[in-house]
Amino acid sequence: MRTEAQVPALQPPEPGLEGAMGHRTLVLPWVLLTLCVTAGTPEVWVQVRMEATELSSFTIRCGFLGSGSISLVTVSWGGPNGAGGTTLAVLHPERGIRQWAPARQARWETQSSISLILEGSGASSPCANTTFCCKFASFPEGSWEACGSLPPSSDPGLSAPPTPAPILRADLAGILGVSGVLLFGCVYLLHLLRRHKHRPAPRLQPSRTSPQAPRARAWAPSQASQAALHVPYATINTSCRPATLDTAHPHGGPSWWASLPTHAAHRPQGPAAWASTPIPARGSFVSVENGLYAQAGERPPHTGPGLTLFPDPRGPRAMEGPLGVR
């Protein structure tokens, strides 16, 4: 939900620096306004990583770039253009975590990011070009989804680029971005004024084109992140699609419950609760995320409450809702 500032096409009075300067000085405030409006818009990033040690094992990491508190996270997978999708895990901050094969371990990494380990063989095995989607809900603000996949040619141990591109927290990025552009704008305006202080101020004349003249868009840097949200799906092998609902859950329903102790089911309220989670400096955070852990050569640390997986003592259908097979 980004806002584009649109600037009417202005016809300069005469060719030359004066006309160009007048146009640029008019465009600049609109660009700044656009940045202010779009700063802090929540976004979601997704990172898919195939483990070098286990070729059938994937780690999906997702994060929410926004200021609201997360009320639910849903991780799903499927084929291209939404074909054959199904839910892998649902993470609720108070009610716990629910996951379905081939998801092995879903967990909160931080207050605004989760990770999911997937492994399996046969029908429910993930493939290198499967599409994974994460949807973060923040009540009552809304919800946001992003998808990612490993390209078929990816080497084990490497990650797909996080989607969308921006990795800094949205609010921080907004503040830094607007501050930087404002500073640059002021310096630029001072430079122009100083350069042209002895020249008459340019007069803007009405456009000589028709009233329906095309409008010039003031493109803000933040719109690149909007474009990044619309990443085309990777081509996927139909033989490599996630299992159908019946084959993925042969027992007729989710038979595993990822249980969190009541006190651990709540996400931490502050950094202290996640003291064991290494928090990199801002610079390294960006480089680690954008470098997709290539620099570190390590898997991202998994911390937080331990998940206890246990089959329901009443049998595989005991926890099933009326839906039956998912």
Partner: nanobody, 127 residues
């Protein structure tokens, strides 16, 4: 941003029919289970029906079984609820939501327990 927009509500006489629609955008609709929930005046949120991601499985609360039919068209990113033989007790605001409330239990349902939610559409059954 994800958006779910319900339509089709209105005033209908007992025994009448309505078809609710929910247009989804901003997410991969076909990857997710979808549900209808409702909230009668002065009451809590009640689960009505759920359909899985490919439309092959459906479930209903007992009070609407045989009268309501949930369906979806993944090519149009739209969820439907066909309501027949409407009764006065079906009067409520109907919400389209993403997710299956059975994941965490039907007790004390709230919109915040779902992955996405619409603004709701009012259905009034009255003579």
């Amino acid at each position: 941003e994800v958006q779910l927009v319900e339509s089709g509500g209105g005033l209908v006489q007992p025994g009448g029919s309505l078809r609710l629609s929910c247009a989804a955008s901003g997410f991969t609709f076909s990857y997710y289970d979808m549900s209808w929930v409702r909230q009668a005046p002065g009451k809590g949120l009640e689960w009505v029906s759920t359909i899985n991601s490919d439309g092959g499985r459906t479930s209903y609360v007992d009070s609407v079984k045989g009268r309501f039919t949930i369906s979806r068209d993944n090519s149009k990113n739209t969820l439907y609820l066909q309501m027949n033989s409407l009764r006065a007790e079906d009067t409520a605001v109907y919400y389209c939501v993403e997710g299956d409330p059975h994941n965490f239990g039907l007790e004390n349902l709230a919109l915040r327990d779902f992955g996405s939610w619409g603004q709701g559409t009012m259905v009034t059954v009255s003579s």
